[in-house]
């Protein structure tokens, strides 16, 4: 008779989670010489230790501290790109603009990107059937707490001009409930960060509106200004052309507005 297992509302742990984390760790440390010293087995042990045998609705940032310590990484603090609801374009951008970094370009972000994981209280098993959903079950679940922890640290490390890519196709271009809106915005350090520059990415080819005037962008500006950080905003009307011009800035068509 199978043992009773808690049924959560979200999808279960990603298939082959342990192997995936280790494979990614090996690949990352090979590609990034500055992280060659990292022991991937220890990273996995620390990752596992953060959630195994713990109730998946009772995870704390403290649980992830051993992993955070092992994954400590210095990225140029003035080359940070945050994003909200537009991950793919942000990642395409940093793949071309190699001196800029999203959270997923760091070891810990790279390890966990697009993965789901959770355990069960008092057993060493990983739950591949279901994991807590942030809305329907609980917010202090392993995945949410992980991203909250690494996002906070990433924002805290930022300095000078910080860029954020926002999705202009969404009803809330800036969403206070997103990780960017609820964590990163509030953890930028005013004594280090001079300006937050938002890039609003347009979806429609014929969309010529100035989305920097959107009420949610004004709300973001207000939050940032109250934190004594300057705010600027740019419309990216043609994301395809924008990426092309990052690749080939000397192209004659790249002098006009993108």
């Amino acid at each position: 008779v199978p043992r009773w297992r808690q049924q959560w509302s979200g999808p279960g742990t990603t298939k082959r989670f342990p192997e995936t984390v280790l494979a990614r760790c090996v690949k990352y440390t090979e590609i990034h010489p500055e992280m060659r010293h990292v022991d991937c087995q220890s990273v996995w042990d620390a990752f596992k230790g953060a959630f195994i045998s713990k109730h998946p609705c009772n995870i704390t940032e403290e649980d992830y501290q051993p992993l955070m310590k092992l994954g400590t990484q210095t990225v140029p603090c003035n080359k940070i790109l945050l994003w909200s609801r537009i991950k793919d374009l942000a990642h395409q951008f940093t793949q071309v603009q190699r001196d800029m970094f999203t959270l997923e370009d760091t070891l810990l972000g790279y390890l966990a990107d697009d993965l789901t994981w959770c355990g069960e209280f008092n057993t060493s098993k990983i739950n591949y059937q279901s994991c807590p959903d942030w809305r329907k079950d609980c917010s202090n679940n392993p995945v949410s707490v992980f991203w909250k922890t690494v996002s906070r640290r990433f924002a805290e490390a930022a300095c000078d001009v910080v860029h954020v890519m926002l999705n202009g196709s969404r009803s809330k271009i800036f969403d206070k409930n997103s990780t960017f809106g609820s964590v990163e915005v509030h953890n930028l350090q005013p004594e280090k960060v001079q300006t937050l520059e938002a890039w609003v990415i347009h979806g429609g080819r014929e969309d010529s509106r100035d989305l920097c005037q959107d009420p949610t962008i004004k709300e973001l500006e207000s939050i940032i200004s109250k934190r004594n950080i300057q705010f600027s905003c740019k419309n990216i009307y043609r994301p395809d052309k924008f990426l092309q011009c990052v690749k080939n800035p000397e192209d004659s068509s790249c002098t006009s507005e993108i």
Partner: antibody, heavy 116, light 108 residues
Framework: QVQLVQSGAEVKKPGASVKVSCKVS????????IHWVRQAPGQGLEWMGG????????IYAQKFQGRVIMTEDTSTDTAYMEMNSLRSEDTAIYYC?????????WGQGTLVTVSS | EIILTQSPAILSLSPGERATLSCRAS???????LSWYQVKPGLAPRLLIY???TRATGIPVRFSGSGSGTDFSLTISSLQPEDCAVYYC?????????FGQGTRLEIK
């Protein structure tokens, strides 16, 4: 305790196909991926292919590309390795193995003999 | 692809002697992902060492592994007649997983 139990020996004619099964117990195929390794008489161990969690797909050693298909049935926790267009040099013991990055566990092996 | 080269191809020693088998990689291998196997005719490969130096469950203490980077070795401190077999090193840090060509250990 992790166990991998493979199907029995097969004798095939050149040009035929063979499908070897590997039933796992003590864990599920959701947790770890299966790799296949063969050893021909008097030869060394040769990795044939296996699941790459980095890319989320099965990858094959160049030598076996297009001639081997590795599949799995997670409902029965059984992995399969099918090889087509068999030649006499495919005579070997075929092993399923699991536990990449951890402790490797091996099936008992399946002898496939290709002979006319 | 990481190529593993084992030496010697054949090693012939007497019981009680010390055997040292070498495995050299074409590029650096993360130690945690280097293993050693013992293979006897008709039997599945037996994992002896993983992580370059950790003995697998049930493996006698006379077997030990060492090395890092591109140079690894397996040592059998005092040979027993039952150690007659072919020994393979394996790396699994990168796909394709690769094996050395093997060292045949003969007991005189």
């Amino acid at each position: 305790q992790v166990q991998l139990v493979q199907s029995g020996a097969e004798v095939k004619k050149p040009g035929a196909s063979v499908k070897v099964s590997c039933k796992v117990s003590g864990y599920t195929l959701t947790e770890f991926s299966i790799h296949w390794v063969r050893q021909a008489p008097g030869q060394g161990l040769e990795w044939m292919g296996g699941f790459d969690p980095e890319d989320g797909e099965t990858i094959y050693a160049q030598k076996f590309q297009g001639r081997v298909i590795m599949t799995e049935d997670t409902s029965t926790d059984t992995a399969y390795m099918e090889m087509n267009s068999l030649r006499s040099e495919d005579t070997a013991i075929y092993y399923c193995t699991t536990g990449r990055f951890f402790d490797w566990f091996w099936g008992q092996g399946t002898l496939v003999t290709v002979s006319s | 692809e990481i190529i593993l080269t084992q030496s010697p191809a054949i090693l012939s020693l007497s019981p009680g002697e010390r055997a040292t088998l070498s495995c050299r990689a074409s590029q650096s291998v993360i130690s945690r992902f280097l293993s050693w196997y013992q293979v006897k005719p008709g039997l599945a490969p037996r994992l002896l060492i993983y992580g370059a130096s950790t003995r697998a469950t049930g493996i006698p203490v006379r077997f030990s592994g060492s090395g890092s980077g591109t140079d690894f070795s397996l040592t059998i401190s005092s040979l027993q007649p039952e150690d007659c077999a072919v020994y393979y090193c394996q790396q699994d840090s990168n796909l394709p997983i690769t094996f050395g060509q093997g060292t045949r250990l003969e007991i005189k």
